[in-house]
């Protein structure tokens, strides 16, 4: 097996041949996130924007309620940055008092929920403490990987608490995906 | 409207193919910087390396006196990281002596100059308080993301402040970009 | 030359067409990992889960002994997200005691090893100070960017401290690679 | 302080050449794009065309494309502008702008007449 | 190339009133911006990408609309509001200007 490693794949002769330009990609940006229900231990969604400003979807990847629907299988590059912001977190002022804590922490998920499967599947996670000593702190978390995914696959972002995600800006928190 | 979005697209036929091997593309890498005069309330941009150790620009995209030069529309990916490095940050001093503060910050901000809008466009930022109580703090900042470019549009990497960056390694601070 | 600058390419009548299915692809996902010597001064390297779960390699990109091996010459994109974790930081405890103090990090380097060059190539790396004031703490480092690779080249993910990795999660921690 | 200063007043024959010049303060002109619009007698404004100074390209109102030429000079920060074959209705005011950098600015304006 | 038509031509009020000029587009553009113009003066940045005001703008002064359509408004009129205005689209090659809109006192 090892000698074939770098053996020519005559595969490609038969593979189907096709323009880049009608790819379904998509790049949503933060809006103002209005208070939804969410189910007790499961991290809220966030929704986008999806045509404004820097904001596209195209060649049918189309964005409905929270998700980007997956209009065909493939590899597809999944990206996404949160910003988050917060008052000082409780973390430091426990540690003045001199007693040690579970540090506060802030994470994003980007989750795929599929027909094939009846749980949601979680993709990519970038979780961090948050300790902060100074009065105001703000940072992102950014994620982007590569999955194969199937025609009619949703994605969505989820967040640990969406009282801290930072919408202000189209630049500071994003979600995106493309074939490739 | 829902019953068609994953109908087939019909305009692959028409579209044209092209060889992936001839798209625009480049990856940048840090230098030491000199310090230029900027514009006030408006971050300095880095200049690159683009042709040295893991460097290159090819296919006509070109980079010139900090910027990468779009030579042909379309849907790029565009990415940086930025290391940051710096003496305690004023923060935990001022934290130290009781008085509460507004915290020092590090950021980047991946920025579009485009004759379509007279403005400077923010692509993606990336921006992060700094309140470390360490005596010397590190820490990158990575952006990523997609975008539709038009020829002609120049692509810069500002940050928030030139004498904080990492310019010791080509692999800890770059700047690149590819047409998908 | 300038003026050639955004002049039509002819290259692309020449270059071969291929079908974007059949390129080498590979997602790897973190796997517990087992203490294994390494030289001093040298980053240990992660090995990784190939095949299940979110785990997959395609098109003759193979992983054997921690590093993926690259089938066929071409522009890369490579990214890798490292979980750390860990209890409080000596930084800390050595601040509260009031000696300044050099403070204790966290690093990722995506490496490559190639034929045609003795040393080992640091491609990609993302390192962070960590001076935590709470008693566990815990944050990723993502990066991401695009190589020139040739063929037969292997590439691997070195960190620091390979005790402090987050290997609990595949979608905390994972590495992967694609032709572009 | 940001500014643009154009050339001075110039006045041609039918069928001669003229060359603009806008000279940039305060601001790099490659961070830019520089443009040039001109207004006739009593009309409204009219796009030429604008020049990247980083890299040359040029985008051009077809109206102008075989008549003009916009060059830069990034070593004296400065930006021209040449129109050949010159004709009675070149007449006009014609303004140097940048755009892409804020705030967009204006030059003072170079007067060209045309006259036998 | 995309056509812009300003409305009215000339615009005749007084100070205090409220004034509404008009720009249609001959297709859709991304954005609109609008030009000041004195006697005598350079055209000077007056809105921007469609609804935001220049450095210096008082903000009796608002900009809307999308598509074909864009407004420029004056809440109430001073007398150094007296000027011709143009709009400019940035969307299509080449360049366009409306051709203009006087607004003078009555």
């Known amino acids: 097996l090892k000698g074939q490693e770098f053996a020519p794949s005559h595969q490609q002769v038969y593979a189907p041949l096709r323009a880049d330009g009608d790819k379904p990609r998509a790049h949503l940006t933060v809006v103002r996130q209005t208070p939804t229900q969410h189910f007790k231990n499961q991290f809220p969604a966030l929704h986008w924007e999806h045509e404004l400003g820097l904001a596209f979807t195209k060649n049918r990847m189309n964005y409905t309620n929270k998700f980007l629907l997956i209009p065909e299988s493939g590899d597809y590059f999944i990206y996404s940055q949160v910003t988050f912001r917060g008052m000082t977190s409780e973390c430091s002022e426990i540690r003045q008092a001199g007693r040690p804590n579970k540090p506060d922490s802030i994470t994003v998920v980007i989750t795929k929920v599929t027909d094939s499967y009846p749980e949601p599947t979680q993709l990519l996670m970038g979780t961090k403490s948050v300790c902060e000593v100074g009065s105001n702190w703000f940072q992102p978390i950014y994620l982007g990987a590569m999955f194969s995914l199937q025609e009619g696959d949703k994605l969505m972002v989820n967040v640990s608490d969406i009282s801290l995600v930072d919408y202000t800006k189209e630049d500071k928190t994003f979600f995106g995906a493309f074939l490739l | 409207l829902k019953g068609q979005e994953f109908a087939p697209s019909h305009q692959q036929v028409y579209a044209p193919l092209r060889a992936d091997g001839d798209k625009p593309r480049a990856h940048l890498t840090v230098v030491r910087q000199t310090p230029t005069q900027h514009f006030k309330n408006q971050f300095p941009a880095l200049h690159w390396e683009h042709e040295l150790g893991l460097a290159f620009t090819k296919n006509r995209m070109n980079y010139t006196n900090k910027f990468l030069l779009i030579p042909e529309s379309g849907d790029y990916f565009i990415y940086s990281q930025v290391t940051f490095r710096g003496m305690t940050s004023e923060c935990s001093e001022i934290r130290q002596a009781g008085r509460p503060n507004k915290p020092d910050s590090i950021t980047v901000v991946i920025t579009k100059v485009t004759d379509s809008y007279p403005e400077p466009t923010q692509l993606l930022m990336g921006t992060k308080s700094v309140c470390e109580v360490g005596s010397n703090w590190f820490q990158p900042i990575y952006l990523g993301a997609m975008f539709s470019l038009q020829e002609g549009d120049k692509l810069m990497v500002n940050v928030s402040d030139i004498s904080l960056v990492d310019y010791t390694k080509e692999d800890k601070t770059f700047f690149g970009a590819f047409l998908l | 030359l300038k003026g050639q600058e955004f002049a039509p390419s002819h290259q692309q009548v020449y270059a071969p067409l291929r079908a974007d299915g059949d390129k080498p692809r590979a997602h790897l996902t973190v796997v517990r990992q087992t203490p294994t010597q390494h030289f001093k001064n040298q980053f240990p390297a992660l090995h990784w889960e190939h095949e299940l779960g979110l785990a997959f390699t395609k098109n003759r990109m193979n992983y054997t002994n921690k590093f993926l091996l690259i089938p066929e010459s071409g522009d890369y994109f490579i990214y890798s997200q490292v979980t750390f974790r860990g209890m409080t930081s000596e930084c800390s405890e050595i601040r509260q005691a009031g000696r300044p103090n050099k403070p204790d990090s966290i690093t990722v380097v995506i490496t490559k090893v190639t034929d045609s060059y003795p040393e080992p190539t640091q491609l990609l790396m993302g390192t962070k100070s960590v001076c935590e004031v709470g008693s566990n703490w815990f944050q990723p480092i993502y990066l991401g960017a695009m190589f020139s690779l040739q063929e037969g080249d292997k590439l691997m993910v070195n960190v620091s401290d390979i005790s402090l990795v987050d290997y609990t999660k595949e979608d905390k921690t994972f590495f992967g690679a694609f032709l572009l | 302080q940001v500014q643009l200063v154009q050339s001075g007043a110039e006045v041609k024959k039918p069928g001669a050449s003229v060359k603009l010049s806008c000279k940039a303060s305060?601001?790099?002109?490659?961070?830019?794009?520089m443009h040039w619009v001109r207004q006739a007698p009593g009309q409204g404004l009219e796009w030429m065309g604008r020049?990247?100074?980083?890299?040359?390209?040029?985008k051009y109102d077809p109206k102008f494309q075989v008549r003009v030429t916009m060059t830069t000079d990034t070593s004296t920060s400065t930006v021209y502008m040449e129109l050949s074959s010159l004709r009675s209705e070149d007449t006009a005011v014609y303004y140097c702008?940048?755009?892409?950098?804020?705030?967009?600015?204006w030059g003072q304006g170079t007067t060209v007449t045309v006259s036998s | 190339e995309i056509v812009l038509t300003q409305s009215p031509g000339t615009l005749s009020l007084s100070p205090g009133e409220r004034a509404t000029l008009s720009c249609r587009a001959s297709?859709?553009?991304?954005?609109m911006y609008w030009y000041q113009q004195k006697p005598g003066q350079a055209p000077r940045p007056w809105i921007y990408?469609?609804?935001n005001l220049a450095s210096g703008v008082p903000d009796r002064f608002s900009g809307s609309g999308s598509g074909t359509d864009y407004t420029l408004t004056i809440s109430r009129l001073e007398p150094e509001d007296f000027a011709v205005y143009y709009c400019?689209?940035?969307?299509?090659?080449?360049?366009?200007f409306g051709g203009g809109t006087k607004l003078e006192i009555k």
């Open positions: 702008s940048r755009s892409g950098g804020l705030p967009d600015v």
């Open positions: 305060g601001f790099d002109i490659q961070d830019t794009y």
């Open positions: 020049i990247d100074p980083a890299s040359g390209h040029t």
């Open positions: 297709s859709s553009v991304s954005y």
């Open positions: 990408a469609t609804s």
């Open positions: 400019q689209q940035w969307s299509g090659n080449p360049r366009t």
